[in-house]
Interface confidence: medium
């Protein structure tokens, strides 16, 4: 049997025997195009492809549509993997989405969706989610049914306002909705009463900006 040399996600890498968390090269489905991603091989059995991470405010998340499409930042730190890759990947296979959150008081919580995919760019990378479980709220902080993705230069939200400009960052804004993990990063003691911060309403309420977030995906049949 030939050894697999290209991997479409971190689950394939894990199954190949590479079980150390770190940066790996993934290949777009049905293509030779490559992308670097952080693979979490430790959390909940490993095999997680990290698609977003915030931890210290070192990366500016108020980016353009093109940047969110292609990805930005460093997989070793804060980054966005890229809507196009995630859309193609999740359109091929059933994926789960795990969102890990940390507040400034040392608490951690998570939300797990048992089916996650992004529509294509022609549908503004609209998010589709079902089957919420976890400790970060019984109600989904990503509005259901899912919204289109919006950025500062591509306003696709359901508001007469421009959510991305007001709340900062690209996100699946509703009008403007109960979450934004790509909002402005606020340090400790400056993280409350901030409507444009890193928000997950059904865990921390209105105006609380989180310390760290990670969004990661894995095949449902892993």
């Amino acid at each position: 049997k030939e050894e697999q040399t290209t991997f479409r996600d971190c689950a394939e890498i894990f199954k190949s025997g590479l079980t150390t968390s770190g940066i790996y090269t993934l290949t777009f489905p049905n293509s030779t195009e490559e992308i670097k991603a952080y693979c979490d091989m430790d959390v909940g059995g490993g095999g997680w492809t990290v698609i977003q991470h915030r931890e210290d405010g070192s990366v500016d998340f108020q980016r353009t549509w093109k940047e969110y499409k292609e990805g930005f930042g460093s997989p070793l730190g804060e980054y966005w993997l890229g809507n196009e890759f995630v859309s193609q990947l999740t359109g091929q296979h059933r994926y789960v989405l795990k969102i890990q959150l940390k507040d400034w008081e040392g608490n951690e919580a998570h939300s797990l969706y048992d089916h996650f995919y992004l529509a294509g760019e022609e549908s503004n990378y609209r998010i589709h989610l079902t089957g919420l479980t976890g400790t970060a709220g019984k109600i989904s902080s990503i509005s259901q049914p899912g919204s289109d993705f919006s950025t500062k230069d591509s306003d696709n939200d359901k508001c007469i306002c421009k959510c991305s400009q007001m709340l900062s960052g690209g996100w699946w804004f509703d009008a403007c909705g109960p979450s934004n993990l790509n909002g402005q990063y606020y340090p400790q003691k400056q993280n409350t009463n901030k409507f444009n911060g890193i928000k997950w309403y059904y865990w921390k309420g209105s105006g609380y900006s989180l310390k760290a977030t990670t969004m990661m995906i894995r095949p449902a049949d892993f």
Epitope: I139, Q144, I160, D174, A175, C176
Partner: antibody
């Protein structure tokens, strides 16, 4: 498209109650706050209160506290405003309006308004 | 409660000419997040109010760029660079900083 459709005009006697409905369509009802604003003839707009359509939390203007009750039926995507102990000065057009907010009810604008419901209080 | 005061009460305008409406609040509307919680609405004859400007200076989607909101803290202005016939109606400012949300008394804009 996104719209709010309110119930029809009402004529009530002093001391009675009125319940106005506001049916939302074209968006996820439970993701927003719904506010109620009234306008008496020749008067300025007057905010009455709001409901978080997701969890049902309400907040009322002190002026109407004890007389107004705002509720919602998520299965029907409809918000209701009931005003009791009606008096002649409650004669007004009553509007529902969707709140754009930081989530949690701190609405910083009303982006969609219902067409208004005329309530006349007369003996 | 925060009291909102608008002037003038009535504003006769000539199409193509500029117009300006003032709104004052009894206390600062500048939030700690840097935004002024002041909105402008237009109520055209026989219609519901419609949002023009939110958070002091942000034009709502679909609002022509001839409308501009400015000001900070307690003094705000809505400017129409060139009035058109469709701009007639009553303009209201509203403070959204704290409940009860309160509106100005309105400014009636009419064509001369």
């Amino acid at each position: 498209q996104v719209q709010l459709v309110q119930s029809g005009a009402e004529v009530k006697k002093p001391g009675a109650s009125v319940k106005v409905s506001c049916k939302a369509s074209g968006y996820t009802f439970t993701s927003y706050a719904m506010h109620w604003v009234r306008q008496a003839p020749g008067q300025r707009l007057e905010w009455m209160g709001w409901i978080n359509a997701g969890n049902g939390n309400t907040k009322y203007s002190q002026k109407f506290q004890g007389r107004v009750t705002i509720t919602r039926d998520t299965s029907a995507s409809t918000a209701y405003m009931e005003l009791s102990g009606l008096r002649s000065e409650d004669t007004a057009v009553y509007y529902c309006a969707r709140g754009v907010d930081d989530y949690g009810g701190n609405s910083w604008a009303f982006d969609i308004w219902g067409q208004g419901t005329m309530v006349t209080v007369s003996s | 409660d925060i009291v909102m005061t608008q002037s003038p009460l009535s504003l006769p305008v000539t199409p193509g000419e500029p117009a300006s409406i003032s709104c004052r609040s009894s206390q600062s509307l500048l939030h700690s997040n840097g935004y002024n919680y002041l909105d402008w609405y237009l109520q055209k004859p026989g219609q519901s109010p419609q949002l023009l400007i939110y958070l002091g200076s942000n034009r709502a989607s679909g609002v022509p760029d001839r409308f501009t909101g400015s000001g900070s803290a307690t003094d705000f202005t809505l400017r129409i660079s060139r009035v058109e016939a469709e701009d007639v109606g009553v303009y209201y400012c509203m403070q959204a900083l704290q409940t009860p949300l309160t509106f100005g008394g309105g400014t009636k804009v009419e064509i001369k």
